[in-house]
Interface confidence: medium
């Protein structure tokens, strides 16, 4: 089955960069968003710090670390109130991600 232009393969995501001219000259605003084409039973999430289609049960039960959201070599730690997770780098630096 061939994909039309701009069509994503099932179960994949891509990062879309939105460029927008500011009212002020020489200032350009850039923001990124993800576009996903997830299969049934999947939902957009994060794997290895990149957008990915993940098992919807992970989101439902807030088992965020089961998405493998951190980079290789980092440790994932679920926030106790299940509002997100932390990724701990080998050097000890901690990055916290919360889900709204």
């Amino acid at each position: 089955q061939f994909l039309k232009e701009g069509q994503l393969a099932a179960g994949t995501c891509e990062i879309v960069t939105l460029d927008r001219d500011s009212s002020q000259p020489r200032i350009e605003e850039r923001s990124q968003t993800a576009r996903c084409a997830c299969r049934k039973g999947q939902i957009a999430g994060t794997t290895r710090a990149r957008p990915a289609c993940v098992d919807a049960r992970i989101i439902k039960t807030k088992q965020w670390c089961d998405m493998l959201p951190c980079l290789e070599g980092e440790g994932c730690d679920l926030l106790i109130n299940r509002s997100g997770w932390t990724c701990t780098q080998p050097g000890g630096r901690i990055k916290t991600t919360t889900v709204s």
């Epitope: 039960t61 088992q63 089961d66 440790g75 730690d77 679920l78 926030l79 106790i80 932390t86």
Partner: antibody, heavy 122, light 110 residues
């Protein structure tokens, strides 16, 4: 084999403070969230609180909230429960518990310590 | 917050089912913990709905039907006589997610 060894229990006075320590072995301690569960004499199990892997996040049951502090030392493979302003209702056996996955809940405990008995009495 | 029968009894070799319902986080599953005497430590027989620790006999199993979780002991033995607690999580705005346990079911092997 996974072992959790609690210490620090004994007779305590009302209004005082206690410090319980759980020494873990047989698994990679820093990879698991840990918790404390207690049991009053002749009663059921009661959730005390939990701590995440790095020690940066904790949560406590309503009966001890504001009086309890859980901390951990991943280098020493220990988790500590400090309980202040002790009451007679704090009497019971305190168990250290290990989570089975990347988190600990009352559904995911896969190992328990033998327990340490605490008696709060004047 | 978790409801389980106060007692069940069975003859050796029979199948025993202990139910547990309620709790605030059914998505997070249920655990089952065996305590043989009030002074002994609990032993995990089932965690995360149906996972069994490697040292627990295969006669112990866990299952879910709707909002009720069931611990099944197929071919109960005398040494299975104990109190069984189910565990789950509940959510409150002041404490967040906090573990809850049932009051315990006393299994008597006749």
């Amino acid at each position: 084999a996974v072992t959790l060894d609690e210490s620090g229990g004994g007779l305590q006075t009302p209004g005082g403070a206690l410090s319980l320590v759980c020494k873990a072995s047989g698994f990679t301690f820093s990879s698991y969230q840990m918790g404390w569960v207690r049991q009053a004499p002749g009663k059921g199990l009661e959730w005390v609180g939990v701590i995440n892997k790095s020690g940066s996040d904790t949560s406590y049951g309503s009966a001890v909230k504001g009086r309890a502090t859980i901390s951990r030392d991943n280098g020493q493979s220990t988790v500590r429960l400090q309980l202040n302003n002790l009451r007679a209702e704090d009497t019971g056996t305190y168990f250290c518990a290990k989570g089975s996955a990347s988190y600990i809940t009352a559904a995911t405990i896969d190992a328990w310590g033998h327990g340490t008995e605490v008696i709060v009495s004047s | 917050a978790l409801t389980q029968p106060s007692s069940v009894s069975a003859n050796p070799g029979e199948t025993v089912k202990i139910t547990c319902s309620g709790g605030g986080s059914s998505g997070y599953g249920y655990g089952w913990y065996q305590q043989k005497s009030p002074s002994s430590a609990p032993l995990t027989v089932i965690y995360w709905n149906d996972k069994r620790p490697s040292d627990i006999p295969s006669r112990f199993s866990g299952s879910k039907s709707g909002s009720t979780h069931t611990l099944t002991i197929t071919g109960v033995q005398a040494e299975d006589e104990a109190v069984y607690f189910c565990g789950n999580d509940d959510y409150s705005s002041d404490s967040g997610y906090v573990g809850v346990f049932g009051a315990g079911t006393t299994l008597t092997v006749l």
